[in-house]
Structures are given as structure tokens and as C-alpha cells.
Interface confidence: medium
């Protein structure tokens, strides 16, 4: 499978909520012994390999935000820790995987990465990630709502096997 990032750039005003999305493409094994580990983290541009650096999102690490579920299941972070920080990650039956960030501030601007790992009988068989940028703006030039910019066809399969 691959990970697509439908949008490469999100531009939002302060105080708004935003949902960043990644999507699994291609065949997904739904066998009983196959599960998926999915998470989000912040990173920075200008690296040799995008998303190799991991930084927390609002002080929550990638492990705090992770989901782990079977290929045929939906899931979301229900724990208080994430919600107290205005965060929720979710995954549906159709391969969409998202993180919602509430009440954005300028400090939320930056590069965000989603990570999906296919686990087959204890072994992380396949590991892919996608990247997107969030710009939070304030003042008269800020949009009234979030504006999203689609990825180019090349970027929309923004895949890096680790």
C-alpha cells in the first residue's frame, strides 16, 4: 500500500480548527493477524529525508497519538490526554487517517507527518509516511476559514519507505 496526502498545504486563521488527512492507497491486507499502527508527529523541512526528525505535536509524542487496529476496523484516540490538548486522531474504514487540531495558534505552524506501519505477526512489514504543511495566520491577511491546497500528482503519493 501507499500513503497519499490529498493536500500539501493548509492555511488557517488563528482560533480555527483543522483536520489534516492522509489516505491509504492500494490493497490493504485485512487478515486477522495483520494490524496497522498509525500516528502523527511534527518534523522540519530541509532534511535529507522528509519526516525523519520527530517532534511532538502540542507536547504529545507520536506514541501518545497513535492508533492500532485491524485492517477492517475504524479507530480514534479517545484518551483524555489528546483531547485535553485539543487533538484527536481518527481512522475510518476507507483508508482515511486524520488528525484534528482545535483552536489553532501561530505555534502550530509547521510540517506535519503521518506514519502508517503494517504489522504482520510481530513484524513491521511495511512502513510509509506522508507530509503536509500547516500555516496559521493572524491579522488582516489571514483567511476567514482554512484554505487547502491540493498536492501535485507527484506529491499526492508522498511515499517514503523507512
Amino acid at each position: 500500500f501507499k500513503v497519499a496526502t490529498p493536500y500539501s498545504l493548509y492555511v488557517c486563521p488563528e482560533g480555527q480548527n483543522v483536520t489534516l488527512t492522509c489516505r491509504l492507497l492500494g490493497p490493504v491486507d485485512k487478515g486477522h493477524d495483520v494490524t496497522f499502527y498509525k500516528t502523527w508527529y511534527r518534523s522540519s523541512r530541509g532534511e535529507v529525508q522528509t519526516c525523519s526528525e520527530r517532534r511532538p505535536i502540542r507536547n504529545l509524542t507520536f506514541q501518545d497519538l497513535h492508533l492500532h487496529h485491524g485492517g477492517h476496523q475504524a479507530a480514534n484516540t479517545s484518551h483524555d490526554l489528546a483531547q485535553r490538548h485539543g487533538l484527536e486522531s481518527a481512522s475510518d474504514h476507507h483508508g482515511n487517517f486524520s488528525i484534528t487540531m482545535r483552536n489553532l495558534t501561530l505555534l502550530d505552524s509547521g510540517l506535519y507527518c503521518c506514519l502508517v506501519v503494517e504489522i504482520r505477526h510481530h513484524h513491521s512489514e511495511h512502513r510509509v509516511h506522508g507530509a503536509m504543511e500547516l500555516q496559521v495566520q493572524t491579522g488582516k491577511d489571514a483567511p476567514s476559514n482554512c484554505v487547502v491546497y491540493p498536492s501535485s500528482s507527484q506529491d499526492s503519493e508522498n511515499i517514503t519507505a523507512a
Epitope: H32, H69, G70, S124
Partner: antibody, heavy 121, light 112 residues
């Protein structure tokens, strides 16, 4: 908070069977493998086998095949390990260990407190 | 079965000094997916084992950076740069590449 609580110590005679239970709480029991590992007195750790509660899939160490059966009851979040035809060298502390996933990497993250099984005539 | 052989079996160390434990597998433990599932566990006295290192050299969350793992193929090493009193216990290497999973026989680290 994840917890694995095992049944109490057992004393058995050679040739008998023992069934050790491992009750899980604090996580989605059906989704994660449960491992069974034993430790004979003064010895190292030995992997016996594993079960994935949601599907009932099992993998056993060949050394124990034919003598061991692992089952799981998802309604009570309890895993069981039965060992038959016990011998004196089966005397050991038996641990259940629950899989945890960190950074997409599964490992033996949660351990029960251990159940001492003594085989003696 | 893959046999994991550790040495030494006993390791007396002075606090602040380095320590090194070797683990050798009887055959390659490279999994078919290219990863090497070699882990190091520490069993402190009276406790269950806890993970220190996974996939040869990755420190688990919360493990002090004085612990490091290295190696490839069949030869692996756990190093502690400066031993502290809390490091006492039995260290086990473990291979999770090929069923049956197997542990080394353990190395008992004690403070001199």
C-alpha cells in the same frame, strides 16, 4: 493502565496437567498477541508459544507441541495455557506477556506477575 | 531452533565503569523483510523483564542513553557506558525473527 494478572501457584504430580490463566485489563485484549514464557529455577527465559485472542491463531514452540494448548476467552479478556504430561523439569515460573506496539514495533511490553508451577511426586 | 549464546554469564562491575555483553546467534537472524529483530531485556531482581533495546540498536522509550546496542548478522553487543547501581539484574538477548523466539541464557550484572 494495562495489567496482566495470573492465577496462583500450583503443585502437581508428574503426568498431571496444569492450566494457568492470565486476565488482561486496560487495553483491547483481542488485538494483541499474548505470549507465554517460562523460567525454571535459576535459569533463563524460554518461549512456550503465543495466541492472538481475536482470531485464536496460535504458534507453539516445537519443544512443547502436543503437550501445550493455548486458548483465550475474549468475553472475560482471559488467556489460558494448559500444559499436559508434566515432568519434574517443567517446574518453573510461567509468565504471560502482552504485546505492546511502540513506533510500529511490537514487543513484549506487559508481563504478568508469574505463576509458580511445581511438579513433584 | 536458533540458539542465542551470551557472554560473560556473570559480570561484576564497579559503578561508573563501562560494561559490555556479547550475544551470538547460531544462524543469521535477519528476517525475510530485511529487519533484524534482536532485542535486549533486563530483568531486575524480583521483577518481570523490561525492554531496553529493539531492532539491534534502537533504545526504547525512557531507557537512559548510557545503554547502546550494536551488531549485525550473528554477532551483537549491549554496552553500558557508565554502570549505575540501578542497572543490576540479568540481561537477556532475544531474537524475534524466526519462530520459535529464543532468549540467550542471561548475563548477571552485579556491582563490585
Amino acid at each position: 493502565q494495562v495489567q496482566l494478572v495470573q492465577s496462583g501457584a500450583e503443585v502437581k504430580k508428574p503426568g498431571a496437567s496444569v492450566k494457568v490463566s492470565c486476565k488482561a485489563s486496560g487495553y483491547t485484549f483481542s488485538r494483541y498477541w499474548i505470549e507465554w514464557v517460562r523460567q525454571a529455577p535459576g535459569q533463563g527465559l524460554e518461549w512456550i508459544g503465543e495466541i492472538l485472542p481475536g482470531s485464536g491463531s496460535t504458534n507453539y514452540n516445537e519443544k512443547f507441541k502436543g503437550r501445550v494448548t493455548m486458548t483465550a476467552d475474549t468475553s472475560t479478556s482471559t488467556a489460558y495455557m494448559e500444559l499436559r504430561s508434566l515432568r519434574s523439569d517443567d517446574t518453573a515460573v510461567y509468565y504471560c506477556a502482552g504485546e505492546e506496539v511502540y513506533d510500529g514495533y511490537p514487543w513484549f511490553g506487559y508481563w504478568g506477575q508469574g505463576t509458580l508451577v511445581t511438579v513433584s511426586s | 531452533d536458533i540458539v542465542m549464546t551470551q557472554s560473560p554469564l556473570s559480570l561484576p562491575v564497579t559503578p561508573g565503569e563501562p560494561a559490555s555483553i556479547s550475544c551470538r546467534s547460531s544462524q543469521s537472524i535477519v528476517h525475510s523483510n530485511g529487519n533484524t529483530y534482536l532485542e535486549w531485556y533486563l530483568q531486575k531482581p524480583g521483577q518481570s523483564p523490561q525492554l531496553l533495546i529493539y531492532k539491534v540498536s534502537n533504545r526504547f522509550s525512557g531507557v537512559p542513553d548510557r545503554f547502546s546496542g550494536s551488531g549485525s548478522g550473528t554477532d551483537f553487543t549491549l554496552k553500558i557506558s557508565r554502570v549505575e547501581a540501578e542497572d543490576v539484574g540479568v540481561y537477556y538477548c532475544f531474537q524475534g525473527s524466526h519462530v520459535p523466539w529464543t532468549f540467550g541464557q542471561g548475563t548477571k550484572l552485579e556491582i563490585k
